[in-house]
């Protein structure tokens, strides 16, 4: 297993609709053809694999399971979007990148993006 640098923004504010997007960039030391990206949430004394995707370079990301994430890739960048977030989902979201093929296997883990989610205020009652 070889180490690899992964960069991601320090802070992101989710939209009022509970959507947060950020870029995860990795310094690929070679020509990887198969890449796995996992988003981890570290908060509340827990570590959770929020979503994971495997993709072949140049193709769309295919997310596993009941994913609340979507994303696209461009070169060594992955554009990740997490949907359906609420204030309680605020936390540190860490990007983990694995170069699966061809060998050797590389692993990189970012420092995390602190995603802040603010629940929208309910609209006041209207007389109209």
């Amino acid at each position: 297993c070889k180490a690899m640098h992964v960069a991601q923004p320090a802070v992101v504010l989710a939209s009022s609709r509970g959507i947060a997007s950020f870029v995860c960039e990795y310094a690929s030391p070679g020509k990887a053809t198969e890449v796995r990206v996992t988003v981890l949430r570290q908060a509340d004394s827990q570590v959770t694999e929020v979503c994971a995707a495997t993709y072949m370079m140049g193709n769309e990301l295919t997310f596993l399971d009941d994913s609340i994430c979507t994303g696209t890739s461009s070169g060594n960048q992955v554009n990740l979007t997490i949907q359906g977030l609420r204030a309680m989902d605020t936390g540190l979201y860490i990007c983990k990148v694995e170069l699966m093929y061809p060998p050797p296997y590389y692993l990189g883990i970012g420092n995390g993006t602190q995603i802040y989610v603010i629940d929208p205020e309910p609209c006041p009652d209207s007389d109209f």
């Epitope: 949430r41 959770t48 694999e49 596993l64 399971d65 609340i68």
Partner: nanobody, 125 residues
Framework: EVQLVESGGGLVQTGGSLRLSCAAS????????MGWFRQAPGKDREFVAA????????SYADSVKGRFTISRDNAKKMAYLQMLFLKLEDSAVYYC??????????????????WGQGTQVTVSS
């Protein structure tokens, strides 16, 4: 709801290992996110680990990360908790639980509506 029965608990020395099993019956097992919780005497029930419906995504409490591994076999309607390097503070009754919801960011708070009867894990020095 599904019916859940845990097994595999017991007495083990510090540093030892156990594998807990959770057998499900009833509704379609693969529709449920599965979780493990534990409760020590005089303490609140706490989240240990959870696994998504297909088994591809997992969540762990910091206190067990790297020592415990959650897994599932949908064909056999089973969930498992492999526990290594057990510590005195791991002693508790361990419960298997099922939540009929998809995965998300905070599986510890999912609406687990099915619970097993629990299995006792005792770690001694």
């Amino acid at each position: 709801e599904v019916q859940l029965v845990e097994s595999g608990g017991g007495l083990v020395q510090t540093g030892g290992s156990l594998r807990l099993s959770c057998a499900a019956s009833g509704r379609t097992f693969s529709n449920y996110t599965m979780g493990w919780f534990r409760q020590a005497p005089g303490k609140d029930r706490e989240f240990v680990a959870a696994i998504s419906r297909s088994g591809s995504l997992k969540s762990y409490a910091d206190s067990v990360k790297g020592r415990f591994t959650i897994s599932r076999d949908n064909a056999k309607k089973m969930a498992y908790l492999q526990m290594l390097f057990l510590k005195l503070e791991d002693s508790a009754v361990y419960y298997c639980a099922a939540a009929p919801v998809p995965w998300g960011t905070r599986p510890s708070t999912f609406p687990y509506d099915s619970w097993g009867q629990g299995t006792q894990v005792t770690v001694s020095s």
